[in-house]
């Protein structure tokens, strides 16, 4: 397997192990550290068929697979209550807001023709308001809400026709919003799109058990990302001067027996099969990890030499997601019989070693609470403190180049296969209320303090 990631488990002396005195580090983050918070369009916008928006694969999936959920129409209604979101952002004092554009809100059937005016107006108003507040927008082009028409007509991401259609959509976004957006994310966590959308069927479009489809979808997502990066790099970066990446998500894993080379090998294989699947072509040598190519010979598509060259280096920073979606449920194929772990610091070290110490944006991090928990989310604070401490140690002790952190999420909202049974917001929203007031939870107050102090003070 490529890279030096496996040194993490063998506790290479170059890696500072966490000893007792370092279990918590009282220190500040680097000056100008980029503090932010994020949402996904489908999770918070609501208004799934309002003002000319087209249906997405998730709108369809909710109605066909999640029988106890009426629709995302309730949600947090960010489409209607934009001002309330902005007030919540003001309250916390973030440097950036990471949100996604709903592709079918702009182009109801996915094809770039004349954009839906109300959708365009919504995102334009949001961007203007962020710029006015000195809040940097980080915009995700695709957070899983593929226009349903593209699924029905082409079979969605299984069909490489989608690559060019996605590039057209991206081009439009660069043209319309690029003057106000300096950070772009093409796709949010493609692993989950492929694995749960086409493997387990737990995510839209809900297809099951076809490993060939899983890896075809992954292949097309990588190629779509690469095409958009080259497009931005050639046609938009020269004058817009922005950065573009793809958010890659992963779990972390520890060997059953820390000195056992077999178990360490399995841990490496586990990380490679999830994170490496997408990171290797983009941040590595342009191809799939060797072990995957060998084992998955009958289902993993092949990159030509020209394609490898095209894929390689198509990210301006490493956008990393580390949260519950990559842990629950974790596919047994990825676990390799080893022990999953929430050690974000070690995951960051693995990325550093495996991909030559890239600049890292933590593009999603946080945990969840039960839906019955309202504003006293002590577990969320505990988890946030733990994760932020690990990030700080990674920066200060391991010299990992983390430049920003995205707390997830700004608001309670629709949580994919968990629907409304869990909450991930720093702001509480009563989904049954008319006004959908955003009430800051304890975690919002805590994060606000962290940002104000730029870390942990004694």
């Amino acid at each position: 397997f490529s890279g030096d990631g496996r040194a993490i488990w063998s506790k290479n002396p170059n890696f500072t192990p966490v000893n007792e005195s370092q279990l918590f580090l009282y220190d500040t983050f680097p000056k100008n550290f980029f503090w932010g918070i994020g949402t996904g369009a489908l999770q918070v916008e609501g208004s799934w068929k309002k003002d000319g928006k087209g249906p997405s694969i998730w709108d369809h999936f909710i109605h066909t697979h999640l029988k106890n959920v009426s629709s995302t129409n309730g949600s947090s209604d960010s489409y209607i209550f934009l001002e309330k979101d902005l007030s919540a952002l003001d309250f916390i004092g973030v440097s950036f807001y990471q949100f996604s554009i709903s592709w079918p809100r702009l182009f109801p059937d996915g094809i770039v023709t004349v954009a839906n005016a109300k959708g365009l107006q919504y995102y334009s108003t949001l961007l203007d308001a962020l710029v006015l507040r000195n809040i940097e927008p980080i915009v995700t082009l695709y957070h899983w809400d593929l226009p349903l028409a593209l699924q029905e007509k082409y079979g969605g991401w299984k069909n490489d026709t989608i690559i060019d259609i996605f590039n057209d959509y991206a081009t439009y976004c660069f043209q319309m919003f690029g003057d106000r957006v300096k950070y772009w994310i093409t796709i949010h966590n493609p692993y989950l799109v492929a694995w749960h959308g086409y493997g387990t069927g737990m995510h839209a479009p809900g297809e099951k058990g076809n490993l060939a489809a899983v890896y075809t979808v992954g292949h097309n997502l990588i190629k779509a990302h690469s095409k958009v990066w080259h497009n931005y790099n050639t046609h938009f970066r020269p004058h817009q001067k922005g950065w573009l990446s793809i958010t890659l998500g992963s779990h972390w894993i520890e060997p059953n027996r820390s000195e056992n080379t077999m178990d360490i090998f399995k841990c490496q294989q586990s990380m490679v099969s999830v994170l490496g699947w997408f990171a290797n072509p983009i941040h590595g040598d342009g191809d799939y990890p060797e072990g995957m190519r060998k084992k998955l010979f009958s289902v993993l598509p092949i990159f030509s030499e020209a394609e490898k060259h095209e894929m390689r280096g198509t990210a301006d920073f490493f956008a990393f997601s580390f949260g519950p979606n990559n842990f629950k449920p974790l596919n047994t194929m990825a676990k390799m019989g080893q022990n999953v772990s929430l050690n974000l610091r070690e995951a960051l070290n693995w990325i550093k070693l495996e991909y030559n110490n890239p600049r890292i944006l933590i593009a999603e991090n946080g945990w969840f609470t039960d839906s019955r928990v309202k504003t006293e989310d002590t577990t969320a604070i505990y988890m946030m403190k733990n994760f932020l401490s690990q990030v700080l140690q990674a920066i200060r002790l391991d010299e990992i180049r983390v430049f920003g952190y995205t707390a997830w999420s700004l608001l309670d909202g629709f949580e994919w296969q968990d629907a409304y049974t869990i909450r991930r917001g720093l702001f509480y929203v009563d989904f049954n209320s008319k006004q959908k007031e955003r009430k800051p939870k304890s975690s919002a107050h805590y994060y606000k303090q962290i940002i104000r102090e730029n870390g942990f003070s004694l």
């Epitope: 058990g209 076809n210 490993l211 060939a212 489809a213 080379t261 077999m262 090998f265 294989q269 060797e290 060998k294 084992k295 998955l296 010979f297 009958s298 289902v299 194929m333 390799m336």
Partner: antibody, heavy 119, light 107 residues
Framework: QVQLVQSGAEVKKPGASVKVSCKAS????????INWVRQATGQGLEWMGW????????GYAQKFQGRVTMTRNTSINTAYMELSSLRSEDTAVYYC????????????WGQGTMVTVSS | DIQMAQSPSSLSASVGDRVTITCQAS??????LNWYQLKPGKAPKLLIY???NLETGVPSRFSGGGSGTDFTFTISSLQPEDIATYYC?????????FGPGTKVDIK
């Protein structure tokens, strides 16, 4: 528990075809490739090819290209391997094997089907 | 195609003896090597995958090692039920290929 049960022994004349079946149970049939491996009398194991039961996609070793066809019937969780234009050197035990993606190995095998080609 | 050679082609040893079989690939196959046990009239059985990983339920007296082109398979203490033919198999490249086998019996 995982089981692969193959059809019984066959005797065929040169030039004829043989179709061996392999019924899977104890796991999701469409989730793992079925591979076919043979062992001629007194010889080693020889890989013939793979078949993905979900898609029906196949890949054959060059040596068998044009003579072998691997198919499946997902409604009865059964894979088939048909070998045509039989010759005496095709006399062998034919095994089906479940391919484990994690291992890159055949983790379960059928009991084998003896195919005798004789005039 | 990658050729796999095994030695010895057969061996006899006493119960309790340590038995070692070697497998050599015609080119570098990294760690993409598995070992199988084949008993007459029985389904073949996977013992070791990726050079040294023991398949679940396989006794710990079986072990494997090596990388690149040279590999070993060891039975630390031969048991009567270990009488069988053992095959190495590479999956570094298609077609998948097996070694010619090593027949192990009891003295």
């Amino acid at each position: 528990q995982v089981q692969l049960v193959q059809s019984g022994a066959e005797v065929k004349k040169p030039g004829a075809s043989v179709k061996v079946s392999c019924k899977a149970s104890g796991y999701t049939f469409t989730s793992y490739d079925i591979n076919w491996v043979r062992q001629a009398t007194g010889q080693g194991l020889e890989w013939m090819g793979w078949m993905n039961p979900h898609s029906g996609n196949t890949g054959y070793a060059q040596k068998f290209q044009g003579r072998v066809t691997m198919t499946r019937n997902t409604s009865i969780n059964t894979a088939y391997m048909e070998l045509s234009s039989l010759r005496s050197e095709d006399t062998a035990v034919y095994y089906c094997a479940k391919y484990n993606w994690n291992y890159g190995a055949f983790d379960f095998w059928g009991q084998g089907t003896m195919v005798t080609v004789s005039s | 195609d990658i050729q796999m050679a095994q030695s010895p082609s057969s061996l006899s040893a006493s119960v309790g003896d340590r038995v070692t079989i070697t497998c050599q690939a015609s080119q570098d196959i990294s760690i993409y090597l598995n070992w199988y046990q084949l008993k007459p009239g029985k389904a073949p059985k996977l013992l070791i995958y990726d050079v040294s990983n023991l398949e679940t339920g396989v006794p710990s007296r079986f072990s494997g090692g090596g990388s690149g082109t040279d590999f070993t398979f060891t039975i630390s203490s031969l048991q009567p039920e270990d009488i069988a033919t053992y095959y190495c198999q590479q999956y570094d490249n298609l077609p998948l290929t097996f070694g010619p086998g090593t027949k192990v019996d009891i003295k």
